[in-house]
């Protein structure tokens, strides 16, 4: 879904245009 380098730190979900979904390795089960 792209790099988070390009995501601006916004003050909340109301400012979001699309939902970014990073791969959270801590929640991946094998």
């Amino acid at each position: 879904c792209g790099s988070k380098d390009n995501i601006k730190h916004v003050p909340g979900g109301g400012s979001v245009q699309i939902v970014y979904k990073p791969v959270d390795l801590s929640k991946v089960t094998s």
Partner: antibody
């Protein structure tokens, strides 16, 4: 696994400052916001502010502007909160939490809390 | 600022009963572009750190029992526990993250 490790209890004198760490592990520190939350004994949760470690940018609850300062050290995966000119009103437990920035904006992992007691 | 109001402030029920608690926001938490409500529910058991239960108003966090259900949209939200267990004794907080973050005052759940 994701962990947020906070320091032990702090006893601080009125008018002084205290700086507390929140050491993150088990995830990419710069991909998530760290929020700080205050809880006085027997009271509810109060959001202080947040920092995005990748850029160092911050947002604060208006009530805590001038009281709390949030910083982050990317080299040690540690976020810090400093409270200045403390009074008895600052006696509380302070939690750090990982905020799932960009998606749910929910705090999915929490530290165990640092208890701050202000007393002379 | 967005103000969050929870009710009731406390309630006591017997194990096995159904519980509902309310959370109201002073403005809509629905982002029309993402079609998400930026409302989360947290459980805080005595002496513990808060735990995330529900985000996006109705999405259960991984590992949370399915007896916990979040519902609502806009300004009115509800957390339902379909069959309360003894281990559900806790304070439940809603929190908005539409603009900055604000917690509600909490609902304390006691077990009779």
């Amino acid at each position: 696994q994701v962990q947020l490790q906070q320091s032990g209890p702090e006893l601080v004198k009125p008018g002084t400052s205290v700086k507390m760490p929140c050491k993150a592990s088990g995830y990419i520190f710069t991909d998530y916001v760290i929020s700080w939350v205050k809880q006085r004994t027997g009271q509810g949760l109060e959001w202080i502010g947040e920092i995005f470690p990748r850029s160092g940018s911050t947002y604060y609850n208006e009530k805590f502007k001038g009281k709390a300062t949030l910083t982050a050290d990317k080299s040690s995966n540690t976020a810090y909160m400093q409270l200045s000119s403390v009074t008895s009103e600052d006696s509380a437990v302070y939690f750090c939490a990982r905020d799932y920035y960009g998606t749910s904006f929910a705090m999915d992992y929490w530290g165990q809390g640092t208890s701050v007691t202000v007393s002379s | 600022d967005i103000v969050m109001s929870q009710s009731p402030s406390s309630l006591a029920v017997s194990a096995g009963e159904k519980v509902t608690m309310s959370c109201k926001s002073s403005q809509s938490l629905l982002n029309s572009r993402t079609r998400k409500n930026y409302l989360a529910w947290y459980q805080q058991k005595p002496g513990q750190s808060p735990k995330l239960l529900i985000y996006w108003a109705s999405t259960r966090e991984s590992g949370v029992p399915d007896r916990f259900t979040g519902s609502g949209s806009g300004t009115d939200f509800t957390l339902t526990i379909s069959s309360v267990q003894a281990e559900d004794l806790a304070v439940y907080y809603c929190k908005q993250s539409f603009y900055l973050r604000t917690f509600g005052g909490g609902t304390k759940l006691d077990i009779k």
